[in-house]
Amino acid sequence: RKAVLDCEAMKTNEFPSPCLDSKTKVVMKGQNVSMFCSHKNKSLQITYSLFRRKTHLGTQDGKGEPAIFNLSITEAHESGPYKCKAQVTSCSKYSRDFSFTIVDPVTSPVLNIMVIQTETDRHITLHCLSVNGSLPINYTFFENHVAISPAISKYDREPAEFNLTKKNPGEEEEYRCEAKNRLPNYATYSHPVTMPSTGGDSCPFCLK
C-alpha cells in the first residue's frame, strides 16, 4: 500500500524530479569532480543513482542530505550528459541532464616587444601568445606588476596586441603578460621582459 501511495504522490508532482549539480561546470581532463544529487523531500529515504548516458555509475541511499558522487573526467566522452535517478520503493524520477565543459588549460604565454624609438618617445607594441589552451583566451599586459591593459579576448590563435607610447623613461621597465581562459583559478604568466632605460644606445627591441 505504501508503494502505491508513493507512486500516486509522484504522479501528482508531490515527489518532484531530483536536482543534479556540481560546484564547477568547467573542468580540465584528469580533474576530479563531485556531483550532487538532491531532492526537495527531506523526510523520505531515497535511493540515488547516477548515470552517464545509459551507463550506471553508482548508487547511494540518502535522507535529507544530497548524495555525492566523486568522478574523474579523463576523456572527452566523460563530459556527459549525466542524469540522476531518485527512487523510492518501486517509483523513480530522473533529473535534467548535466554536462561538463572540458577546457584545456593555457600554457605559459610568450611576450614579444617591438619598439620604435624617437627622440622624445618610445612607441611600444606588446604581443602575447599562449600556443595551447581552449579559446577564448584572455590576455592582460603588465608594466612593473601593474595592469596596463584591459583583458583582451582572443577567439583565434593569433597573438594579442597592445600599443603604448611613453616618454623616454629614465628607469628600466619590466613587462609581462597573463593568459587565462574559462578554467577557474588557472592563469599563467610570461617571463618578464625588461626594457632598459634610455641611457646610451642599449635598446635591443628598438627600430630606429
Epitope: V26, P81, D97, S99, T101, V131, S134, L135, P136, S153, K154, Y155, D156, R157, E158, N181, R182
Partner: antibody, heavy 119, light 110 residues
Framework: EVQLVESGGGLVQPGGSLRLSCAAS????????MNWVRQAPGKGLEWIGM???????FYANWAKGRFTISRDNSKNTVYLQMNSLRAEDTAVYYC?????????????WGQGTLVTVSS | DIQMTQSPSSLSASVGDRVTITCQAS??????LAWYQQKPGKAPKLLIY???TLASGVPSRFSGSGSGTDFTLTISSLQPEDFATYYC????????????FGTGTKVTVL
Amino acid sequence: EVQLVESGGGLVQPGGSLRLSCAASGIDLSYYAMNWVRQAPGKGLEWIGMIVGGGITFYANWAKGRFTISRDNSKNTVYLQMNSLRAEDTAVYYCAVGSDGGISDFNIWGQGTLVTVSS
Amino acid sequence: DIQMTQSPSSLSASVGDRVTITCQASQSISSYLAWYQQKPGKAPKLLIYRASTLASGVPSRFSGSGSGTDFTLTISSLQPEDFATYYCQQAYSLSNVDNFFGTGTKVTVL
C-alpha cells in the same frame, strides 16, 4: 547526444530575405562557437561566420553586410539572417559547432537546409 | 588573409591503394588544421583535428601530418566507403577571412 537541426530554407526571390534557424540540443551554446557554412551545388564548403559565447560575431569578408548571425539563449538556437539574396546564394546551409569557444574544428554538423534563390 | 590550397583537386584510385592529399596554407597556422570527409547529399564529417589527432570513431587507416604551412592527409589502404570529397580547414586565424576551407579533393574509383 549533441544534435543540431537547421530549418527555414526554401525558395526565395532575388532581392528577398530569409532567416535560417539552428536548434541545438545536448550542448550549452554559451560555451561553444556556432558556425554557419554553406555549399553551392557541385561546389566546395564556404564558411559564412560564427557567433561565440558572449554573442560576439565574426564573418567572412564576403558575408559582411548581407548576413547576420544571432542567438537566443533561452531557446538554445542560433539564427542566420540573409538579406538582398542573389542567385549565387543558392546552396545548402549548415550550422556546425566547434570543439572550442572560438575558431576550431567543427565536430558536429546539422543536416543542412536548402536555400534556392530564383525568380 | 590565409588561403588554403588543396592538391590534387581530384584523383582516381582503387580499393587497397595508399592515397595522399596535401593542403597548403598561405602562412603558418602552426598545427591548427582539420580534415573532413563529405559524401554526396551528406554533411561533412570531421576526420582529423590539430593536424594529426584522429577524431572519435574514425578508422586508423586515416592519418594526418604536417605543421606550419604544409599538411598531408593519408589513407593507408583505401576502402569502398572512402570514396568521397575531402576538405582541409584552418583553425588558426579570424583575421580578414575569405574562407576557412580548402578547395577540396574528390576521390573517385579508378
